[in-house]
């Protein structure tokens, strides 16, 4: 007979040798080893290497076995899950070479301090990666971008403070994410992005409630139903959800979803949401705002969708944080060339502060399309995603300017034709919005005269009606520059032109702002309806280091035309500037909020 | 044609020892892992042991440690060594092929009758 | 030990018409790793050995006739016999190849009224 036991389960050999006083590998190991467990043995360093003949291993349990090392040295071809648990492991050897099979790798309950890089490179397969019970204080930039199928990942009962702001960009099918039990104070900023995370434990961090945490609130508060307090031996979907696990550690263990962010900028640049609650929802469409002066090109990559389940406004959210990258002297507007349109190169070089404002609106159900203009070429229904880029400069004084890049991508097989040049088209008077992009840039007074007043304008020369309100708010009793919100709104069922108008309001320093139109209180009005009234720059400057001129939008970055509307139909949309400061913890150069 | 022929039953009393064979044909028999199964008289079917192509026997708990399952492929047979046997253990005893690493059994012999009795 | 339970275990048929046998396993068969069910269905015929009808839940072995169908998943199965034929009549068996102990069915006898 031999030493360990031998089963078959699911055509594969099962050999279990566990807790045999093995300090090495069973001489007798059946060749056809398909699932072999080692654990409780007293191994202490182990190399793959060991089982490279082993070529039907798929399943290898190596817990409790004391280990201090592991060597990937050997290619096990077919191994699917790997069991290092409730070792002495300090450090993990780079697995992707080893094991490029493998789907689920448990690491938990070990001593691991850190992780390099690139430890999971060339793990394209894993699904399940469990990390709770060690050390961990910090994870590195990029540690999950190789593990694309990532399904669950457990961190919990670290010592992690703080995580990388895109840990799970690119992770579509993660369903469960275990961060309990660690130093934590804060999310990122766009931290989730648009995933929808069935199952997410939170409790018993360190989380700090301040104006930072708005966009972990507000995540918390889209997301109620999906945070869970873990137990021990509890089946998650055996248990009900609870939000309120998640408490501020700062504030008497109040729950985080229910901090009131008093004294916050509204709308706060740390959040990826609006804070207009009491709006019914628009589950059709999110838009989301970006008001910048950081000089930092920002990337958001859009999906455009023709239809999406009537599930959560989540789920149908598309867009992914930021990327930042370094900029060049030169600003250059370009649109990326596709079949049949052009590339359109514009080069501005300049140096006073730019603010920008990108308004992009994703369309999910599919009654409005987007469509070339006449002069275009139709792509081929199935196009493959094609990149339309925007690009906007928004330099600070004495720095280098900066781009703001706008990525619109279709699924492949699409019949959605994208030009390069986003037409907005309704077929009928709708309040469904279309995927675009609108641009506005603001500049120094320069020698150049321009505009005060921002038009959308067509390809050719015609006169298109610009949204009509705009809002600007700001808390009372600030001090310093504080960052300014704006909401642009279209009243419902309008068929008469709206002329523009530009609003200065302050709330009330006790309101919780939830609903701008209902607690704002208007200070200063001024109707901007021809060229000739008062330029808007002196309303701003008062808020403003700089002041603003608002720009007409490049017609080649944006042309919105409507049909069969007397005006042009946007959600409404709130908006933050900020300043240049590094310090303020508001000014994030890329929140956004969305609004319904 | 696969074919599979058993053999070496017949009566012995508690305590003793039988080898049943199976001379298989027809197919590759060493690609393919082979089993026993046994039925008592006018009862279901009972896995008895199986053993993969590359030689590795398992057991239920029934019979390990009693019974011992092995193959030469050169002689294209599969072997049953059955020591310490109880009346329980009476019954037709079917050599069986199995499909692959699969653990279904996609032929059949014919059977031999084991009556374990005093 | 996955325990395999049949029923009936008596089957009383009228050649032409359909028939229907139901095997339960105390726990699923389902490979989440490739999503099949690991159950085969036999039949005994009177004094012969056990045939493979039917594998991995639905697929018919070859040689069987397309009257014999299989269906079910996780711990609920079926066997059916569109119209039950003469040569049909024997104890039908299932078995679970999902993980050792292979374990079957006590049987379900068909036999024609």
């Known amino acids: 007979q031999h030493t360990c036991s031998i089963s078959k389960v699911t055509s594969l050999l099962e050999v279990n040798c566990e807790n045999k006083k093995l300090t090495a590998l069973p001489a007798d190991l059946p060749a056809d080893t398909g699932i072999l467990h080692l654990g409780e043995n007293q191994l202490g360093t182990f190399s793959t290497a060991s089982l490279v003949h082993f070529t039907h291993l798929t399943y290898l349990y190596l817990d409790r076995c004391e280990l201090t090392s592991l060597q990937t040295n050997g290619k096990l071809i077919k191994l699917e899950n790997l069991d290092l648990s409730h070792n002495n492991l300090k450090s993990l050897p780079s697995l992707g070479w080893a094991l490029p099979a493998l789907t689920t790798l448990d690491v938990s309950f070990n001593k691991l301090g850190s992780l390099s890089p690139g430890v999971l490179d060339g793990l394209s397969q894993l699904q399940e990666l469990y990390l709770q019970n060690n050390d961990l204080k910090s994870l590195p930039p990029g540690l999950l971008l190789p593990t694309t199928k990532l399904k669950k990942l457990n961190l919990a009962n670290n010592k992690l403070r703080e995580l990388p702001s895109g840990l799970l960009d690119g992770l579509e099918d993660l369903d469960t994410l275990y961060l309990q039990r660690n130093w934590l104070r804060t999310i990122p900023k766009g931290f989730f992005g648009t995933l929808l995370l069935p199952f997410v434990f939170l409790h018993a961090n360190s989380w700090y409630c301040d104006c930072e945490i708005l966009y972990f609130r507000h995540w918390l508060q889209e997301n109620a139903n999906n945070v869970y307090l873990w137990k021990q031996g509890v089946d998650v979907k055996d248990t009900t959800p609870n939000v309120a696990s998640v408490r501020c550690a700062n504030l008497d263990n109040a729950p985080v979803y229910s901090y009131p962010g008093k004294g916050c900028p509204t709308s706060s640049g740390d959040t990826d949401y609006d804070d207009y609650d009491d709006i019914p929802d628009v589950p059709a469409t999110r838009t989301e705002v970006k008001f910048s002066t950081n000089t930092k090109v920002h990337t958001t990559h859009w999906s455009l969708l023709a239809a999406a389940p009537s599930t959560s406004q989540d789920s149908q959210m598309i867009s992914l944080p930021p990327t930042h990258k370094p900029t060049k002297k030169q600003s250059t507007f370009i649109h990326t060339q596709s079949p049949g349109f052009t590339t359109l190169p514009e080069t501005m070089e300049s140096n006073p502060t730019f603010y920008s404002l990108k308004l992009n609106t994703v369309l999910i159900p599919s009654p409005t399309t987007l469509e070339p203009t006449s002069t275009q070429a139709t792509p081929e229904p199935n196009i493959q995603p094609m990149l339309t880029t925007s690009t906007l400069t928004t330099p600070e004084h004495s720095t280098t300017p900066v781009p703001t890049t706008t990525i619109l991508t279709t699924p492949e097989h699409s019949t959605i034709p994208v030009p390069t040049t986003a037409i907005l088209t309704t077929p009928k008077p709708s309040t469904i919005p279309v995927p675009t992009t609108a641009t506005l840039t603001t500049l120094e007074p320069s020698t150049t005269p321009v505009p005060t007043t921002a038009t959308l304008t067509t390809p050719e020369p015609s006169t298109t009606l610009v949204p009509t309100t705009a809002t600007l708010t700001t808390p009372e009793h600030s001090t310093t520059p504080v960052p300014t919100t704006a909401t642009l709104t279209t009243p419902e069922h309008s068929t008469t032109p709206v002329p523009t108008t530009a609003t200065l309001t302050t709330p009330e320093p006790s309101t919780t702002l939830t609903n701008l139109v209902s607690t704002i209180s208007p200070v200063l009005t001024t109707t901007l309806t021809t060229p000739e009234s008062t330029p808007i720059e002196t309303i701003l400057e008062q808020f403003f280091t700089t002041e603003l001129t608002l720009l007409p939008t490049l017609e080649s970055t944006t042309t919105i035309i409507p049909e069969q509307n007397s005006f042009l139909n946007l959600p409404e949309v709130a908006l933050v500037s900020s300043d240049t400061s590094e310090s303020s913890p508001f000014l994030n150069s890329d929140f956004c909020c969305f609004l319904p | 044609e696969v074919q599979l022929v058993e053999s070496g039953g017949g009566l012995v009393q508690p305590g003793g020892s039988l080898r049943l064979s199976c001379a298989a044909s027809g197919f590759t028999f060493s690609s393919f892992a082979m089993s026993w199964v046994r039925q008592a008289p006018g009862k279901g079917l009972e896995w008895v042991s199986s053993i993969t192509s590359a030689g590795t026997p398992y057991y239920p708990d029934s019979v390990l440690g009693r019974f011992t399952i092995s193959r030469d492929n050169s002689k294209n047979t599969l072997y049953l060594q059955m020591n310490s046997l109880r009346a329980e253990d009476t019954a037709v005893y079917y050599c069986?092929?199995?499909?692959?690493?699969?653990?279904?059994?996609?032929?059949w012999g014919q059977g031999t009758l084991v009556t374990v009795s005093s | 030990d996955i325990v395999m339970t049949q029923s009936p275990l008596s089957l009383p048929v009228t050649p032409g018409e359909p028939a229907s046998i139901s095997c339960k396993s105390s726990?699923?068969?389902?490979?989440?790793?490739?999503?099949?069910?690991?159950l085969a269905w036999y039949l005994q015929k009177p004094g012969q050995s056990p045939q493979l009808l039917i594998y991995f839940t639905s697929t018919r072995e070859s040689g069987v006739p397309d009257r014999f169908s299989g269906s079910g998943s996780g711990t609920d199965f079926t066997l059916k016999i569109s119209r039950v034929e003469a040569e049909d009549v024997g104890v039908y068996y299932c078995?679970?190849?999902?993980?050792?102990?292979?374990?079957f069915g006590q049987g379900t006898k068909v036999e024609i009224k």
């Open positions: 726990q699923s068969l389902l490979n989440s790793r490739n999503q099949k069910n690991y």
């Open positions: 078995q679970q190849h999902y993980s050792s102990p292979w374990t």
């Open positions: 069986a092929k199995s499909r692959g690493y699969e653990d279904y059994f996609d032929y």
